[in-house]
């Protein structure tokens, strides 16, 4: 029985040209996390395997930095980065847990005035 829950940063906004940390946390389970995959719609961004380290997709390698922890730092944001991001936790023995984050990338002036969860 899968008892765990994924906590995410939920809906976040960030400024065009800036950076954002995508972060999920798995709680309420003793299952072992074997790896975490980060995906945007149908595109793989990165995989962090507990033993084998990081794999970063070539299309993102210049703009994605591993970490902190199992999270992912997305840099040099563009408006095209707006959309859904998924953290997919592969665990043993529970199986797979998926968390969702919605990122909105805003023009600088908009982001500077009252955007929630803004990352400077």
């Amino acid at each position: 029985m899968m008892t765990g829950t994924i906590e995410t940063t939920g809906n976040i906004s960030a400024e065009k040209g800036g950076s954002i940390i995508l972060q999920c946390h798995l709680s309420s389970t003793t299952a072992q996390v074997t790896q975490v995959a980060w995906e945007q719609q149908d595109q793989l961004l990165a995989i962090c395997n507990a033993d084998l380290g990081w794999h970063i997709s070539p299309s993102f390698k210049d703009r994605v930095a591993p970490g902190p922890g199992l999270g992912l730092t997305l840099q040099s944001l563009t408006v095209n980065d707006t959309g859904e991001y998924f953290c997919i936790y592969h665990t043993y023995p529970d199986g797979t847990y998926t968390g969702r984050i919605f990122l909105e990338v805003l023009e600088s002036s908009v982001a500077e005035h009252g955007a929630r969860f803004q990352i400077p």
Epitope: T34, Q35, A37, E39, D42, Q43, L44, I47, N49, A50, D51, L52, G53, W54, H55, I56, S57, P58, S59, K61, P66, H90
Partner: antibody, heavy 119, light 107 residues
């Protein structure tokens, strides 16, 4: 130039063990994981497992867990795979292979070590 | 474990032909797929990584495509030196698994 040089062919008896080495050169050994792949009958490839030379962390295919042990010697930039309790099904060519930088695809391979299990 | 199925064990083609080799994953692997070429008596060589990226020095007649469960490796104009076995591999989740291989034969 990156090179992975494996030890020579082995003829071993059923029930025995074999330890294959993979000596590396041309790159910083601790910055890349090292993997081992079995090829039976000249065709099918099977991933045995991988090791992180930096911290000794290992990931095994459950099929080989308990019989295969992956180790490294950082001082000589050499990776090892030991396979125990051998049977005729273990007769195969074994490769060490190194993935790329932040990429799991294996871009450098050793020349292979042939292991024959026969009484 | 994820099963990678290459439906054709053998494919026969002529020099200059276009050939597609397919690989199907038993569950989604996003774009975490590589293609290797193995010539007789040699080690596998990486041709395509992350489903569609050509490895350094690989001729542009070799291409890869696909996402999720269905992947295709294409040789746009087969050359005599392309006689080999071609393997797909998923590295989305351990244990990393390979397809059974497709042997390309030149008529």
């Amino acid at each position: 130039e990156v090179q992975l040089q494996q030890s020579g062919p082995e003829l071993v008896k059923p029930g025995a063990s074999v330890k294959i080495s993979c000596k590396t050169s041309g790159y910083t050994f601790t910055e890349y994981t090292m993997h081992w792949v079995k090829q039976s009958h000249g065709k099918n490839l099977e991933w045995i497992g991988g090791i992180n030379p930096n911290n000794g962390g290992t990931s095994y295919n459950q099929k080989f867990k308990g019989r295969a042990t992956l180790t490294v010697d950082k001082s000589s930039s050499t990776a090892y795979m030991e396979l125990r309790s051998l049977t005729s099904d273990d007769s195969a060519v074994y490769y060490c292979a190194r993935p790329g930088w932040y990429n799991y695809a294996m871009d450098y391979w050793g020349q292979g070590t042939s292991v024959t299990v026969s009484s | 474990d994820i099963v990678m199925t290459q439906s054709h064990k053998f494919m026969s083609t002529s020099v200059g032909d276009r050939v597609n080799i397919t690989c199907k994953a038993s569950q989604g692997v996003s774009t975490a797929v590589a293609w290797y070429q193995q010539k007789p008596g040699q080690s596998p060589k990486l041709l395509i990584y992350s489903a569609s990226y050509r490895y350094t020095g690989v001729p542009d007649r070799f291409t890869g495509s696909g996402s999720g469960t269905d992947f295709t490796f294409t040789i746009s104009s087969v050359q005599a030196e392309d006689l080999a076995v071609y393997h797909c591999q998923q590295h989305y989740i351990t244990p990393w698994t390979f397809g059974g291989g497709t042997k390309l034969e030149i008529k």
